[in-house]
Interface confidence: medium
C-alpha cells in the first residue's frame, strides 16, 4: 500500500486515417490488467475541451464527453481486459482530424501515446475500356476522394513514359459539397499491355490495374493508406 | 463540480510529525490520481508526489523518504504523512486531483504548515 | 529529473503590453506542458493545457505555443487582472516540474 515507483505502462498507438462518413479506428493497446475495474481509458483530443471518450470501472463514463463526439464514440469493452484501448468513431467528419491522446490508467500505474488521426475521402478505381470512344481508351473512375489527388497513369510495356499528354483528368464536387468523384480517360491504348490508375493524395494511394488482351480483360485494384506506421 | 479541500495543517517542531488531509466531494474518486504540490513562503510551487484509487504512488526522489502518500476510497480521502519536519519544509500544501491529464485541473485552497520552535 | 527553466524570472508591463513568458525544458517533452497563474493566497490557476490548448473560460488573449524543449505563454493585451505569478509544468515524467515563475508586474 503506497508502494513507491515510476509506474508507468506501455501504451501504443498506430496513427491511421479516417473516411469522412464512414466509421473509423483509432488504434491504441496497453498492458492488461487481470480486473476490468481498475482500467480507465481517456480519449483526448488536441485543441478539444471535452473529453472524446472515457471508459471506467467497467463501463462507458461520457459525463465529461465533448459535444462534438456524443453519440459517436466506443470502446471495444470485450477487449479492454486484455490491453485493447481502440476507440471506434461513428460517421468521420473532417473536423475529426488531429492529435489524439489515449491515456490510460490501470492499477499497475498509468501511460500515455499520442495519435495522429488523419480524415478525408477515398475510394477503390475502378479501369474499364471505353467503347464509346472513337479510338482504344481507358476509363479510371473513382467515386469519393478529398483532399483532391493527383492522377498518374502507367505501363508495363512503357515503364517510365509519361502519360501526361495523352490523358485528360476531371474532379467533379459530390453532392455533400466536400469529396469528389475522379474520372481520368487515357487515349491511344495499345493491346496486349496492363496499365495503372494510380490516384495519390496524403492519406491514401489507390491503383486500379487493367490487363487487355486479344481474348480478355483482367482488373484489379489495390489500396493503401499512407499514413498508418506504428 | 469536484472540491478538495485541505486539513491538518498548522504549526509543529523540527523533528516532528504532521498529517495533512484532502477530502474529495462532487465527483468521481476512482480512477484519478491525487497529487500533493507543495509551495514554501515566496517561492515557486513543488511537486511532492501523487496516488491512485488503489494505492500506488510515486514520490518526489528528494522527498520520498519522509513523506508518504495514502488513500481511503471508503471516505474519498487521500493524505500526506510527513516525518522528520525540517525549517525549510514550512510551504502551503495543495492538493490537486490529476495534474497529468489534459482535461482535469481542480485544486484544493492549500494549508499552511509552519515548522519551527 | 527534467529541469524547466523559466524566463525571465520578473517583468515590469503596463496594461495593453503585450507580454511573452518562456520555459525551456531540459529534455524533449513533447507537448506535456500546462501553464499556471497563481494570484497571492490563492492557488493556482490552468490556462493553458497541452502546450497551446486555452483552458474553458480563460481569455483568448492567452496563448501558449512550443513543443519539444521551447514553449511559450503570450499575453496579448496586458489587463488589470493578469498581474500575477505564471508557472509551467511539465507532466512528461516524474518527478513532474515546474519553472520557477515568472512574476508580472505593474509598470
Known amino acids: 500500500f503506497g508502494i513507491s515507483g515510476r509506474h508507468s505502462i506501455t501504451v501504443t498507438t498506430v496513427a491511421s486515417a479516417g473516411n469522412i462518413g464512414e466509421d473509423g479506428i483509432l488504434s491504441c493497446t496497453f498492458e492488461p490488467d487481470i480486473k476490468l475495474s481498475d482500467i480507465v481509458i481517456q480519449w483526448l483530443k488536441e485543441g478539444v475541451l471535452g473529453l472524446v471518450h472515457e471508459f471506467k470501472e467497467g463501463k462507458d463514463e461520457l459525463s465529461e464527453q465533448d459535444e462534438m463526439f456524443r453519440g459517436r464514440t466506443a470502446v471495444f469493452a470485450d477487449q479492454v481486459i486484455v490491453g485493447n484501448a481502440s476507440l471506434r468513431l461513428k460517421n468521420v467528419q473532417l473536423t475529426d482530424a488531429g492529435t489524439y491522446k489515449c491515456y490510460i490508467i490501470t492499477s499497475k500505474g498509468k501511460g500515455n501515446a499520442n495519435l495522429e488521426y488523419k480524415t478525408g475521402a477515398f475510394s477503390m478505381p475502378e479501369v474499364n475500356v471505353d467503347y464509346n470512344a472513337s479510338s482504344e481508351t481507358l476509363r479510371c473512375e473513382a467515386p469519393r476522394w478529398f483532399p483532391q489527388p493527383t492522377v498518374v497513369w502507367a505501363s508495363q510495356v512503357d515503364q517510365g513514359a509519361n502519360f501526361s499528354e495523352v490523358s485528360n483528368t476531371s474532379f467533379e464536387l459530390n453532392s455533400e459539397n466536400v469529396t469528389m468523384k475522379v474520372v481520368s480517360v487515357l487515349y491511344n491504348v495499345t493491346i496486349n499491355n496492363t496499365y495503372s490508375c494510380m490516384i495519390e493524395n496524403d492519406i491514401a494511394k489507390a491503383t486500379g490495374d487493367i490487363k487487355v488482351t486479344e481474348s480478355e480483360i483482367k482488373r484489379r485494384s489495390h489500396l493503401q493508406l499512407l499514413n498508418s506506421k506504428a | 463540480e469536484v472540491q478538495l479541500v485541505e486539513s491538518g495543517g498548522g504549526l509543529v517542531q523540527p523533528g516532528g510529525s504532521l498529517r495533512l488531509s484532502c477530502a474529495v466531494s462532487?465527483?468521481?474518486?476512482?480512477?484519478?490520481?491525487w497529487n500533493w504540490v507543495r509551495q514554501a513562503p515566496g517561492k515557486g510551487l513543488e511537486w511532492i508526489g501523487e496516488?491512485?484509487?488503489?494505492?500506488?504512488?510515486t514520490y518526489n526522489p528528494s522527498l520520498k523518504s519522509r513523506f508518504t502518500i495514502s488513500v481511503d476510497t471508503a471516505k474519498n480521502s487521500f493524505y500526506l504523512q510527513m516525518n522528520s519536519l525540517r525549517a525549510e519544509d514550512t510551504a502551503v500544501y495543495y492538493c490537486?486531483?490529476?495534474?497529468?491529464?489534459?482535461?482535469?485541473?481542480?485544486w484544493g485552497q492549500g494549508t499552511l504548515v509552519t515548522v519551527s520552535s | 529529473d527534467i529541469q524547466m527553466t523559466q524566463s525571465p524570472s520578473s517583468l515590469s508591463a503596463s496594461v495593453g503590453d503585450r507580454v511573452t513568458i518562456t520555459c525551456r525544458a531540459s529534455?524533449?517533452?513533447?507537448?506535456?506542458l500546462g501553464w499556471y497563474q497563481q494570484k497571492p493566497g490563492k492557488a493556482p490557476k490552468r490556462l493553458i493545457y497541452?502546450?497551446?490548448s486555452l483552458q474553458s473560460g480563460v481569455p483568448s488573449r492567452f496563448s501558449g505555443s512550443g513543443s519539444g524543449t521551447e514553449f511559450t505563454l503570450t499575453i496579448s493585451s496586458l489587463q488589470p487582472e493578469d498581474f500575477a505569478t505564471y508557472y509551467c509544468?511539465?507532466?512528461?515524467?516524474?518527478?513532474?516540474?515546474f519553472g520557477g515563475g515568472t512574476k508580472v508586474e505593474i509598470k
Open positions: 490537486a486531483r490529476e495534474l497529468y491529464n489534459w482535461n482535469v485541473d481542480h
Open positions: 462532487g465527483g468521481s474518486f476512482s480512477g484519478y490520481y
Open positions: 496516488i491512485n484509487h488503489s494505492g500506488s504512488a
Open positions: 529534455q524533449g517533452i513533447r507537448n506535456d
Open positions: 497541452a502546450a497551446s
Open positions: 509544468l511539465q507532466h512528461n515524467s516524474y518527478p513532474r516540474t
